[in-house]
Amino acid sequence: LDLSNVQSKCGSKDNIKHVPGGGSVQIVYK
């Protein structure tokens, strides 16, 4: 099972990509 592309819901924000709005978001960061 390849989990290399799975993004943590509770990890740090260090890897957040700057997207142009909420329409581009995959998950909601807490």
């Epitope: 924000k13 700057h18 142009p20 709005g21 909420g22 329409g23 995959q26 960061y29 807490k30």
Partner: antibody, heavy 120, light 112 residues
Framework: QVQLVQSGAEVKKPGSSVKVSCKAS????????ISWVRQAPGQGLEWMGE????????YYNEKFKGRVTITADKSTSTAYMELSSLRSEDTAVYYC?????????????WGQGTLVTVSS | DIVMSQSPLSLPVTPGEPASISCKSS????????????LAWYLQKPGQSPQLLIY???TRESGVPDRFTGSGSGTDFTLKISRVEAEDVGVYYC????????FGQGTKVEIK
């Protein structure tokens, strides 16, 4: 408690540039987007653009592309908005706001506003 | 560009009475992955900076009185004030953040 403190009022000549600053305190500056919004006298709110200080990445309103430049200095937690080729229609109050990036994408803290007057 | 349209543009109200403001977007603001509508409501009181009231179309910002209620999904949204108070006067703006940011024209709420 997050606070955004903007620079003081400016009077500029047509054709010149203005640079407004927005100093943030009380939060992690690089975790949020700083947006710039302007309001001409008696008019509504108009979004100009935003910066993600962590990466320096920006997005702009097409209307202002080529005339506006938004930058950020992480070391001083300060964002800047520079508008060039000023005309009388640019007379407005300019606000910076913290955009709660990654969650609500809503502007939950606002600066006090900076009045820029363009007059010959 | 996403266009935001508010109505009415002016709303005279009687204290203690309800009030309602409509906001329509030119395209859906619903992200099917996060199941959130990226629509916020702001109030700008006279002489002040705008303040956030509602985000995600219906989530009240901390400290906002529960007489303010946001509803709607997709392209049609509503802000309701159950009982208007004198301190509620000002200009109300809806704003989309689905793609970039766009504000509605604003609705001026004033006491009759």
């Amino acid at each position: 408690q997050v606070q955004l403190v903007q620079s003081g009022a400016e009077v500029k000549k047509p054709g010149s540039s203005v640079k407004v600053s927005c100093k943030a305190s009380g939060g992690i500056f690089s975790d949020y987007v700083i947006s710039w919004v302007r309001q001409a006298p008696g008019q509504g709110l108009e979004w100009m653009g935003e910066i993600f200080p962590r990466s320096g990445s920006t997005y702009y309103n097409e209307k202002f592309k080529g005339r506006v430049t938004i930058t950020a200095d992480k070391s001083t937690s300060t964002a800047y908005m520079e508008l060039s080729s000023l005309r009388s229609e640019d007379t407005a109050v300019y606000y910076c706001a913290r955009d709660y990036y990654g969650t609500s994408f809503a502007m939950d803290y606002w600066g006090q506003g900076t009045l820029v007057t363009v007059s010959s | 560009d996403i266009v935001m349209s508010q109505s009415p543009l002016s709303l005279p109200v009687t204290p203690g009475e309800p009030a309602s403001i409509s906001c329509k977007s030119s395209q859906s603001l619903l992200n099917s992955r996060t199941r959130k509508n990226y629509l916020a409501w702001y109030l700008q009181k006279p002489g002040q900076s705008p303040q956030l009231l509602i985000y995600w179309a219906s989530t009240r910002e901390s400290g906002v009185p529960d007489r303010f209620t946001g509803s709607g999904s997709g392209t049609d949204f509503t802000l309701k004030i159950s009982r208007v108070e004198a301190e509620d006067v000002g200009v109300y703006y809806c704003k989309q953040s689905f793609y970039l940011r766009t504000f509605g024209q604003g609705t001026k709420v004033e006491i009759k």
